[in-house]
């Protein structure tokens, strides 16, 4: 990872951690993520259909960045959400959200990022996802659009 | 630090941590950082010519914020990168990046920040740096422009 | 929390952590926060009159996001600060700050977030607060505006 092999595993319990990067074949919501190649990390957490699946209850720092850009600004409202789903609960819970309106000059080529990060108490079997309002405006470069967490 | 002396060192192994703040005599890339005065932290990590040098392989949360501003907006494309260099590898690896285009109204005084933060698996001897596209547009106040990490 | 009860307390020492969310009855600075309901966390740290009160010296990752929005853009300068106060020191210390100027098109409905996050060495009895320049432009939804920290 990051251009060199992972360090040998230590004897102590593995850190629960994930860092997933943008995957350009996302076609619908939630966003899908690269979980294998490049600067990706996935340890003690599972990745399933766009979601990070918690397998140990506890406190986690969860973060995501999304890079929006377009050829010709028309100021479509942009939103970027990290939300949680659990089969025991009927509704998605929005944990963090960023919104942008009136952020560029009409007609111009434009680019802007949204960053979210905070601590949450997560329970085993919680599924975490990222949602955006305008998929066609997302650039999926691994350094620009990502989703991760680690257990405190 | 933060206006009061550091706490007495604990017996247990020191936490690997850094928080460096903007240094206005940066003249070229990568950005240089204040590593001594103010709200700076540097423990178990070395600072060398703009870079944070990892001396223990492991998982790190790495972050940076850059505050861009100008007297008269001309919408120059802005970029803010955290990248990694290691003598074993020929090329810099961009870990995180933020880009901005069409972000202010021509002619106006303007100000905007870029924030990056994520988890990476770093190896001893990795050097981490911050790069920006327009040095003259960066304000280096310690509360506004910074670069840090800590070992999980 | 996050739609399900907290896990049973473990025997080991409780993690010092806080995640407070926007409270719309903030009337003046510093911002006030929801410390009880919703996705709030408060453990090993006290909340008092808008502030997080540190009760154990050490290294903390501190973060905040503020969601600004308005009906009709007039590009009022926006600022978002995390600052520290301690009775031993005469002056507030600004730890992190974000500023925005010329960020929307005059007359349009607009929305924008500011995110801050970094590591600091905090001392017992330090009080941490969040300040914004334009209270009337803040939206206090729990997913949009928040303030938190955790001890490394």
């Amino acid at each position: 990872q990051i251009g060199h092999p992972s360090p040998p595993p230590e004897k102590k319990e593995l850190r629960k951690v994930a860092h997933l990067t943008g995957k350009s074949n996302s076609r619908s919501m939630p966003l899908e993520w690269e979980d294998t190649y490049g600067i990706v990390l996935l340890s003690g957490v599972k990745y399933k259909k766009g979601g990070l699946v918690i397998n140990e209850t506890g406190l986690y720092f969860v973060y995501s960045k999304v890079y929006f850009r377009g050829q010709s600004c028309n100021n479509l409202p942009l939103s970027h959400k990290v939300y949680m789903r659990n089969s025991k609960y009927p509704q998605d819970l929005v944990m963090m959200e960023g919104k942008m309106m009136s952020y560029c000059t009409t007609g111009q080529m434009w680019a802007r990022s949204s960053y979210l990060g905070a601590v949450f108490n997560l329970t085993s079997a919680d599924h975490l996802y990222v949602n955006v309002s305008e998929l066609s405006l997302v650039n999926f470069e691994e350094s620009q659009t990502f989703f991760g967490l680690y257990k405190l | 630090q933060i206006g009061h002396p550091s706490p007495p060192p604990e017996k247990k192994e020191l936490r690997k941590v850094a928080h460096l703040t903007g240094k206005s005599n940066s003249r070229s890339m990568p950005l240089e950082w204040e590593d001594t005065y103010g709200i700076v932290l540097l423990s178990g990590v070395k600072y060398k010519k703009g870079g944070l040098v990892i001396n223990e392989t492991g998982l790190y949360f790495v972050y940076s914020k850059v505050y861009f501003r100008g007297q008269s907006c001309n919408n120059l494309p802005l970029s803010h990168k955290v990248y990694m260099r290691n003598s074993k590898y020929p090329q810099d690896l961009v870990m995180m990046e933020g880009k901005m285009m069409s972000y202010c109204t021509t002619g106006q005084m303007w100000a905007r920040s870029s924030y990056l933060g994520a988890v990476f698996n770093l190896t001893s001897a990795d050097h981490l740096y911050v790069n920006v596209s327009e040095l003259s547009l960066v304000n280096f106040e310690e509360s506004q422009t910074f670069f840090g990490l800590y070992k999980l | 929390q996050i739609g399900h009860p907290s896990p049973p307390p473990e025997k080991k020492e409780l993690r010092k952590v806080a995640h407070l969310t926007g409270k719309s009855n903030s009337r003046s600075m510093p911002l006030e926060w929801e410390d009880t309901y919703g996705i709030v966390l408060l453990s090993g740290v006290k909340y008092k009159k808008g502030g997080l009160v540190i009760n154990e010296t050490g290294l903390y990752f501190v973060y905040s996001k503020v969601y600004f929005r308005g009906q009709s853009c007039n590009n009022l300068p926006l600022s978002h600060k995390v600052y520290m106060r301690n009775s031993k020191y005469p002056q507030d210390l600004v730890m992190m700050e974000g500023k925005m100027m010329s960020y929307c098109t005059t007359g349009q409905m607009w929305a924008r977030s500011s995110y801050l996050g970094a590591v600091f060495n905090l001392t017992s009895a330090d009080h941490l607060y969040v300040n914004v320049s334009e209270l009337s432009l803040v939206n206090f939804e729990e997913s949009q505006t928040f303030f938190g920290l955790y001890k490394l």
Epitope: - | Q71, S72, G107, Q108, M109 | -
Partner: antibody, heavy 119, light 106 residues
Framework: QVQLVESGGGVVQPGRSLRLSCAAS????????IHWVRQAPGKGLEWVAV????????FYADSVKGRFTISRDNSKNTLYLQMNSLRAEDTAVYYC????????????WGQGTLVTVSS | DIQMTQSPSTLSASVGDRVTITCRAS??????LAWYQQKPGKAPKLLIY???SLESGVPSRFSGSGSGTEFTLTISSLQPDDFATYYC????????FGQGTRLEIK
């Protein structure tokens, strides 16, 4: 009503220093950027420097960069211009002027103070 | 740097005349132009901003037009109080003033 009143001008030798002040009243000083603009005798207007509403950022004309320093004290509603290493070509009437909504044009001006640099 | 060139440098006119002052920018400045009036021994006074917007309190006989590189200030019917020097100023890229146009009594 909005008022800007400059002071501190006078005759000074080349290489010496001078500090100008601009006292503001009639508006919320701490929410406006303020500029210095100068006018050499019988000549046109030349922009000199600006300081942002909170004092966080300052910008200068190339002709004065490194020699002049703009500052403000929002608690005193006062703007300053510290002029060092003065030259004959700095001789001018110096005006402070209020910025209009961060747009780099000027809706209110002071009456000016004359600085003469001469040996 | 953007250069601003005013013409004419001096203009002689009579009360009641319609007068036009021109300001040219060395490159396009969109509509980011202001006009000021200055009387001897006094500070400049803002008349027009954003090329054509009349500042509050300024008589309606003053008007501005133009965009890109060519701008005009027009006084529809000269009054005795209007004899002064007029400056254009661009704020598209930093700040530069024209050299001024002196409007004198014919």
């Amino acid at each position: 009503q909005v008022q800007l009143v400059e002071s501190g001008g006078g005759v000074v030798q080349p290489g010496r220093s001078l500090r100008l002040s601009c006292a503001a009243s009639g508006f919320t000083f701490s929410t406006y950027g303020i500029h210095w603009v100068r006018q050499a005798p019988g000549k046109g207007l030349e922009w000199v420097a600006v300081i942002w509403y909170d004092g966080s950022d300052k910008f200068y004309a190339d002709s004065v960069k490194g020699r002049f320093t703009i500052s403000r004290d929002n608690s005193k509603n006062t703007l300053y211009l510290q002029m060092n290493s003065l030259r004959a070509e700095d001789t001018a009437v110096y005006y402070c002027a209020r910025d209009r909504d961060n747009w780099n044009y000027f809706d209110y001006w002071g009456q000016g103070t004359l600085v003469t640099v001469s040996s | 740097d953007i250069q601003m060139t005013q013409s004419p440098s001096t203009l002689s006119a009579s009360v009641g005349d319609r007068v036009t002052i021109t300001c040219r920018a060395s490159q396009s400045i969109s509509s980011w132009l202001a006009w000021y009036q200055q009387k001897p021994g006094k500070a400049p006074k803002l008349l027009i901003y954003q090329a054509s917007s009349l500042e509050s309190g300024v008589p309606s006989r003053f008007s501005g037009s133009g965009s890109g590189t060519e701008f005009t200030l027009t006084i529809s019917s000269l009054q005795p109080d209007d004899f002064a020097t007029y400056y254009c100023q661009q704020y598209n890229s930093y700040i530069t003033f024209g050299q001024g146009t002196r409007l004198e009594i014919k």
